[in-house]
């Protein structure tokens, strides 16, 4: 249950996360399972531990083996195992099955291919994408953040897709590649003008000064997997990232849910340590897709403090 397979190619960066989770205040120790020898935390080492992460910069075939991570809370130790295999680079174009990440499916409306494990790395856009070892070119292919979007997907688009990016650690650059299969499926779905389920239009949300508050923007866009659908928050008509208030943040990543077969997204706006001036702002929940944009406005009002422990 608490063991995880990880793999990589020699001379590339590989970063592995401990399969056991914890709190930021917990310490994590890493060991070579066979020898029980502690893995150093100093970054000058080629292989070193950094909290929940074990870093091979770069990896070598001899690094293959089982690594133990122990997440130490004050009263309990949680043990996990990372089974790491480092392979020699192939001279030909074929990517063997043992180097493949999970297969993803796409359709005409949704053709996002996420680059596997990329969230573990310190990388900067753009990603490079290859299909069957050929660099992808043409307007149909768009590298966006950590995924590839293919317009007007056809059955011929099925195949093995490789993302390539650079991991930066203390000014040194390391290459990383990851490959996964993409299959194309027919989908009977439709898209609608966005319908915002929450918040209600002109809703007044009661908050307590000094406490944290969450606002959820939730909207549905049709049936089946949707292409180009998004929900987001604006403050006084400005994007959250441009507003410049670090206490107010959107939850990273949009949660996709299928309620009664409908494709819905939600985005949580987190306000830390609510202040008086937050009550003066206009909070707009925006839902948009190819059909257009819908906006619901929320305002905050002060709630009389009550015992929040009850």
């Amino acid at each position: 249950k608490f063991s995880k397979q990880s793999w990589g190619l020699e001379n590339e960066a590989l970063i592995v996360r401990c399969p056991r989770q914890g709190k930021p205040s917990y310490t994590v120790d890493w060991y070579y399972s066979q020898t029980n020898k502690s893995i150093p935390t100093q970054e000058r080492n080629r292989v070193f531990a950094s909290g929940q992460l074990l870093k091979f910069l770069p990896a070598a075939v001899a690094d293959s083996g089982i690594y133990t991570c122990i997440v130490r809370s004050p009263t309990f130790n949680r043990t996990g195992y990372a089974n790491v295999t480092i392979y020699k680079k192939q001279s030909d174009c074929n990517v063997p099955d043992y180097l493949m990440y999970s297969t993803v499916s796409g359709s005409e409306k949704n053709s996002k291919i996420y680059c596997p494990t990329i969230d573990l790395y310190n990388w900067t856009a753009p990603l490079e994408w290859f299909k069957n070892c050929q660099a992808l070119q043409g307007s149909r292919y768009r590298a966006h953040k950590s995924f590839l979007v293919i317009d007007n997907v056809m059955t011929e688009d099925a195949g093995d897709y490789t993302c390539k990016f650079i991991h930066n650690e203390n000014g040194a650059n390391y290459s990383v590649t990851a490959t996964r299969s993409f299959t194309v499926k027919d989908e009977q779905g439709f898209s609608l003008f966005p319908v915002i389920g929450a918040p209600a239009q002109n809703e007044i949300k009661e908050v307590e000064i000094g406490k944290n508050a969450n606002l959820t923007c939730s909207a549905c866009f049709g049936k089946g997997t949707q292409f180009l659908a998004a929900v987001l928050w604006q403050l006084n008509g400005t994007k959250i990232t441009d507003f410049g208030e670090p206490r107010i943040q959107q939850e990273e990543g949009q949660n996709q849910s299928f309620s009664n077969g409908l494709a819905c997204l939600d985005m949580v706006l987190r306000i830390a340590d609510v202040k008086e001036e937050d009550l003066l702002l206009q909070y707009d929940c925006l839902a948009l897709n190819l059909h257009g944009l819908r906006r619901h406005t929320v305002r905050l009002s002060r709630k009389n403090p009550i015992d929040h422990h009850s």
């Epitope: 989770q21 709190k23 205040s25 004050p74």
Partner: antibody, heavy 120, light 111 residues
């Protein structure tokens, strides 16, 4: 908004088993770092920690009571259940459930408590 | 078990004055440079309410009149200035070792 609410019998007979349910909202017990614990307080006395359960199903018990306690969670129902066997009149107390949140391990939100009397 | 001894058992303070409650642990409650000691306020008929966590951090929404200090084995809760609605029992609690333990409580009264 985080809330916790205890439910269970108000009166149990000696030797019987007490089952208490904590129903919570405003957080998920599948979130890394979260826990829910049980604490009791006999009338006019100090608080006594009984047990807690973590997001990854790690369970910790008060060694003095471990043989009598079982704690379980149902993440989908947002519930934590504590059972205590072989009840005795000295177990008469208000029983609280509380959340363990934050970056460190401590009870940050408490339920209102439920009073349990052990008497024949 | 880590035994927490609070003193005094009770104290009476005039409004506007300072109240100081101490908690001594039978062994250190330090973990990775952090003191795992909390303070709770409990009013009659109510559940405990978190005031201070990891020795000196004031919980969100708690008035700045409450402060905590200390490390290792000796900890202090200070209320300055005391107000009439601070009448309550105050408990310290450690989460360094299982079983988590509480102090026996200090009853604060207003003169």
């Amino acid at each position: 908004q985080v809330t916790l609410k205890e439910s269970g019998p108000t009166l149990v007979k000696p030797t019987q088993t007490l089952t208490l349910t904590c129903t919570f909202s405003g957080f998920s017990l599948s979130t890394s770092g979260m826990g829910v614990g049980w604490i009791r307080q006999p009338p006019g006395k100090a608080l006594e920690w009984l047990a807690h359960i973590w997001w990854d199903d790690v369970k910790q018990y008060n060694p003095a009571l471990k043989s009598r306690l079982t704690i379980t969670k149902d993440t989908s129902k947002s519930q934590v259940v504590l059972t205590m066997t072989n009840m005795d009149p000295v177990d008469t107390a208000t029983y609280y459930c509380a959340r363990i949140g934050g970056d460190y391990d401590y009870f940050d939100f408490w339920g209102q408590g439920t009073t349990v009397t052990v008497s024949s | 078990d880590i035994v927490l001894t609070q003193s005094p058992a009770s104290l009476a303070v005039s409004p506007g004055q300072r109240a100081t409650i101490t908690c001594r642990a039978s062994e250190s409650v330090e973990y990775s440079g952090t003191s795992l000691m909390q303070w709770y306020q409990q009013k009659p008929g109510q559940p405990p309410k978190l005031l201070i966590y990891v020795a000196s951090n004031v919980e969100s929404g708690v008035p700045a009149r409450f402060s905590g200090s200390g490390s290792g084995t000796d900890f202090t809760l200070t209320i300055n200035p005391v107000e009439a609605n601070d009448i309550a029992n105050y408990f310290c609690q450690q989460s360094r070792k299982v079983p988590w333990t509480f102090g026996q409580g200090t009853k604060l009264e207003i003169k």
